[in-house]
Amino acid sequence: SSPCPQAWGPPGVQYGQPGRSVKLCCPGVTAGDPVSWFRDGEPKLLQGPDSGLGHELVLAQADSTDEGTYICQTLDGALGGTVTLQLGYPPARPVVSCQAADYENFSCTWSPSQISGLPTRYLTSYRKKTVLGADSQRRSPSTGPWPCPQDPLGAARCVVHGAEFWSQYRINVTEVNPLGASTRLLDVSLQSILRPDPPQGLRVESVPGYPRRLRASWTYPASWPCQPHFLLKFRLQYRPAQHPAWSTVEPAGLEEVITDAVAGLPHAVRVSARDFLDAGTWSTWSPEAWGTPSTGTIPKEIPAWGQLHTQPEVEPQVDSPAPPRPSLQPHPRLLDHRDSVEQVAVLA
């Protein structure tokens, strides 16, 4: 068998670090057998069999000019093997960040903090942190470690499914190359990394007969669980075309009636979502949707004032273990307490 341990990486390649002493090993001989070393394609002897170094070639303070292919020969001139030297650096700890678009799963991504120049792979795992007692943190079999399955196609990402919202996790991402391994441990709580995807299906419609109104409606992001234990709250921004500043409101449900739109101007509207108990952070903004207030006349039949404000409000049961997805939202309000001046003008 070969006296040369096979480093992780392609066969026939040996590795070293620039500026350091590098030993190359002749693979096809018995350990200690004296050999001669040559650079591939060059007749000049680099190290003879009488060096006392046996089957190894020592390169002091290797640099990039030493990279390439080497040939070793036994005393009788037989080929002992060929070795390719590749120089690079040991791994540095990768940089890791984790994010969650819902409260049941999270993903972690990583980047090398320094390029090693060598073949590199990543080992990813996680454990649930269980604190037993005041300050002690002892491992128990049920807390892992478990593998964090990596995305196919080499994307630097792994996903933890079925996470517990109230638990803490320790993510382990280890960068491995032929010169060693380096580990980044990152403590993660789902509550702090939760960032929903933006709301979907944003629509902006005029309200016939009301030249300063727009009705915006949207739906939960598809990535949010269908039977949520945790609801989302929303933030809506709107502005007239060519106007630099956004106005911001926090709607109660999945729609909002804007009552101070600028008559005749198109308005941009966007929405963002966040866990209703303020865990994590706000989502990115949804793509903007546009709408222009109605310029038409008042509808012929205006409902009585009382009917406008007596629509049933559907709210989840407080003691319900899993409130239904809040698709049943309060009915649209044509009128709103925020624009009594317009109400008087319209109803007079």
């Epitope: 090398p112 320094q114 390029i115």
Partner: antibody
Amino acid sequence: EVQLLESGGGLVQPGGSLRLSCAASGFTFSWYSMTWVRQAPGKGLEWVSSIVPSGGHTQYADSVKGRFTISRDNSKNTLYLQMNSLRAEDTAVYYCAKGPGWGSFDLWGRGTLVTVSS
Amino acid sequence: DIQMTQSPSSLSASVGDRVTITCQASQDINNYLNWYQQKPGKAPKLLIYDASNLQTGVPSRFSGSGSGTDFTFTISSLQPEDIATYYCQQNESQSPTFGPGTKVDIK
């Protein structure tokens, strides 16, 4: 020669913007994480922001999050810091520093002074 | 964030003296601690990395030790050119933090 050279500092009013640059030479810039560290007059060192070789991960101190943006152009061997909504407390000498790895700084520039004042 | 404290905040010693600076982290940082020297008007310079490793080209009179939360930096024989402020810095976390510094001068 291995070196880092910052530029872009100067006097700016509160609420204003400034873009710092750091030109790297003498090493393979695209292999290393890069960092901005600042030092207010007469004070200690404060880490500001770091970026990995690919630019794919960035990190910011809480004091600058949402106002500063770190970026790099590996084809130009240059690191940047875009500073918006500047405050008086951002007044400092800003140093650019190189890895190894993330969070160790074995090469520093001479620094560029940013003064935020009305 | 991990907080770093240093003591003393300043010291005066004679040429040839042994000088010791301590650094404490608010939580366990393993051995992920660096020491920097900053001379007046100059950029900082890395002296010690990973708690005890001497950076290439740094004189052997500088040394570091410690692990976990408590670390020590030593100048075995103070030289006039060592007048500077010395900072410890943790990089266990992905948000590095510096200690407040220790100013060293000659008596």
